[in-house]
Interface confidence: low
């Protein structure tokens, strides 16, 4: 008799794929543009990335450090009107892209939360949550919560408002903290809160350390849903050298939880390569004309246009991973088991019941390595086969679809492999 199928977990929309942050509308659109109407024209691009949600803004009125001149219910006219926003929401909905609004109050000022007027600000946030929920947004983000006094209790209250409106609405909190204890204390009192932090930014780019950070986090958070990113707002290139971007993309898309990216992460956008551009929000490189300041500074392979035409580009890898993440049960909600594979390597299995299973092997080092996969670390339900098919490599040159002998697995410097194998009873 066939074994009984495992019951599927309840899946919210943010469980099904990546979130894409556009913190600075002007930098994202470039060319002196940067409004909601223009963003509407970029939704097809977001669809091509197969992201599930767009984290937008802040876009509300905020006069730097002036609480009286900060209105969370009003869109800054530089970004457009309420009508433009409604139109964007409608278009996004048609493309199955959810819109999450960033309500970090004093986003133009020194302290994001006007530290001396916390109660006034908290009331403004409450009113704003109710207003924008009625307007049809799918969730909210608040950042820099380490600057918010009594953050846990405020977050719990805002979560109640959000979830009270609909279980299908999401609250994201962001912190600059990388300290696990601080992160856990924020999560403890807030069930279902999605928290972005700098926790992984301190991974030191080594396999062992990354493995220990990931497993510690998953063990500490138990069975609650996580998000994965390297910070609450910044680009991956702020933390990683270019050669590790592919590896981290593969990892973020295949860990259990919601991957969260910033605009430009998909092309390896790097402020350091664009003189004069701010680290936190460099101009998005749509094509070679996107950064006219220094002629010749931008080559085709740095842009969306150039990378779209190259199947071996970072953007092409992002699209493939995003596609896999959104349709494979084992990656959507499968169990996770990390195991030893040798120094410099981080490897894990994702599996769900009788569905196709995935093996991820990541070489963080700058030397080629043979992987010594220690299957003895794995429970019986997640045993390794002798061979697995190569779904993709982060490096060019491997024949995709070919079976690889796991005992003889060799990885190039900074190479990540995504392998698949069937369930065997």
């Amino acid at each position: 008799r066939a074994p009984r199928c495992r019951e599927l977990p309840a899946q919210k929309w943010w469980h099904t794929g990546a979130l894409y942050r556009i913190g600075d509308l002007q930098a994202f659109q470039g060319h002196g543009a940067g409004n909601l109407a223009g963003l509407k024209g970029r939704l097809d691009y977001l669809s091509s990335l197969k992201v599930k949600g767009l984290v937008l803004g802040p876009i509300h009125k905020n006069q730097k450090d002036d609480v009286a001149q900060t209105d969370l219910l009003q869109i800054d006219p530089n970004f457009g009107s309420k009508e433009d926003f409604d139109s964007l929401l409608q278009s996004a909905k048609k493309k199955s892209i959810r819109v999450i609004l960033d309500l970090t109050p004093n986003y133009r000022g020194e302290n994001s939360w006007f530290s001396t007027q916390v109660d006034t600000v908290a009331t403004k946030v409450k009113d704003a949550l109710e207003f924008w929920l009625q307007a049809g947004v799918d969730g909210f983000q608040v950042r820099d919560i380490e600057n918010l006094k009594d953050a846990s209790s405020f977050l719990a209250e805002w979560q109640n408002i959000t979830k009270g409106f609909s279980e299908d609405r999401l609250l994201i909190a962001g912190t600059n903290s990388s300290d696990l204890q601080q992160i856990l204390s924020l999560l403890e009192s807030n069930k279902d809160l999605l928290l972005t932090s700098s926790y992984l930014s301190d991974s030191g780019s080594t396999g062992e350390h990354t493995k220990s950070l990931v497993t510690q986090y998953l063990n500490a958070t138990g069975n609650r849903w996580c998000s994965w990113s390297l910070s609450q707002a910044r680009l991956l290139t702020s933390f990683l050298p270019a050669q590790l971007l592919r590896l981290y993309q593969l990892m973020l898309f295949t860990l259990p939880g919601t991957p969260v990216f910033s605009y430009g992460d998909e092309i390896g956008l790097d402020a350091a390569a664009l003189p004069g551009q701010p680290m936190e929000a460099p101009v998005m490189l749509w094509d070679e004309s996107s950064f006219p300041d220094i002629p010749g500074a931008v080559s085709a392979n740095m842009t969306v246009k150039g990378q779209s035409e190259d199947p071996g580009s970072l953007l092409s890898l992002f699209r493939r991973l995003s596609d896999q993440r959104s349709k494979e049960r084992s990656l959507l909600h499968g169990d996770f088991h990390a195991f030893s594979a040798g120094p410099g390597l981080f490897s894990y299995i994702r599996h769900w019941d009788q569905n196709e299973r995935f093996l991820v092997v990541l070489n963080f080092g700058d030397v080629g390595l043979s992987a010594g996969l220690q299957a003895s670390d794995l429970p019986a339900s997640a045993s390794l086969p002798a061979k697995a098919d190569l779904l993709l490599s982060t490096q060019p040159g491997r024949e995709e679809g070919s079976p690889l002998e796991l005992e003889r697995l060799k990885l190039e410097p900074h190479e990540g492999l995504l392998l698949r194998f069937p369930y065997a009873a």
Epitope: G204, S238, P275, A297, D366
Partner: antibody, heavy 114, light 107 residues
Amino acid sequence: QVQLEESGPGLVATSQSLSITCTVSGFSLTNCGVHWVRQPQGKGLEWLGVIWPNGITIYNSGLMSRLSISKDNSKSQVFLKKNSLQTDDTAMYYCARGGHYGSSSYAMDYWSQG
Amino acid sequence: DIQMTQSPASLSASVGETVTITCRASGNIHNYLTWYQQKPGKSPQLLVYTAKTLADGVPSRFSGSGSGTQYSLKINSLQPEDFGSYYCQHFWNTPYTFGGGTKLEIK
């Protein structure tokens, strides 16, 4: 092993141009950035600029107008050119490897003798 | 531009002692801090990168720590070969400025 070796004139007249060549071995300029740093006698280090593997150059904004960095990947050479020299440009000039495709990307891990 | 303030500017200590050199950045540099050692007449040598990772071949008596804007380099049980100048440098954004240096001399 990794080496960086400079060649150029020891002496340049005021208001003339300085050209220094840094020839590297043991690594490829398509994989690593090269930084330029200078140090006046008895003083501290000053970062001048960098040329990344993809050829993009970034300069110290205070010196940008008189500075240019270029390279020839095939010859494993990086060039520093500085126009209209003043007496306060007198210093030891170093080239150093940085942006290596490896764990020490955010550092200059090998330096020339200057 | 981020400014790096190093202290002390000079320091004299005896072999076997422990010394600490500090570096303060004018903005958050998120651990993108590097330490170098320079002996008279020689080029600088990498000691520590990303605030606390020891470069290859650097003795374990050296250690880096810190976060945000405050960083330090500690040398336990000073050896004769440790005397010279020490510089910090940030790699958060360009220009990648250096601290003013700390001259460590034998007492």
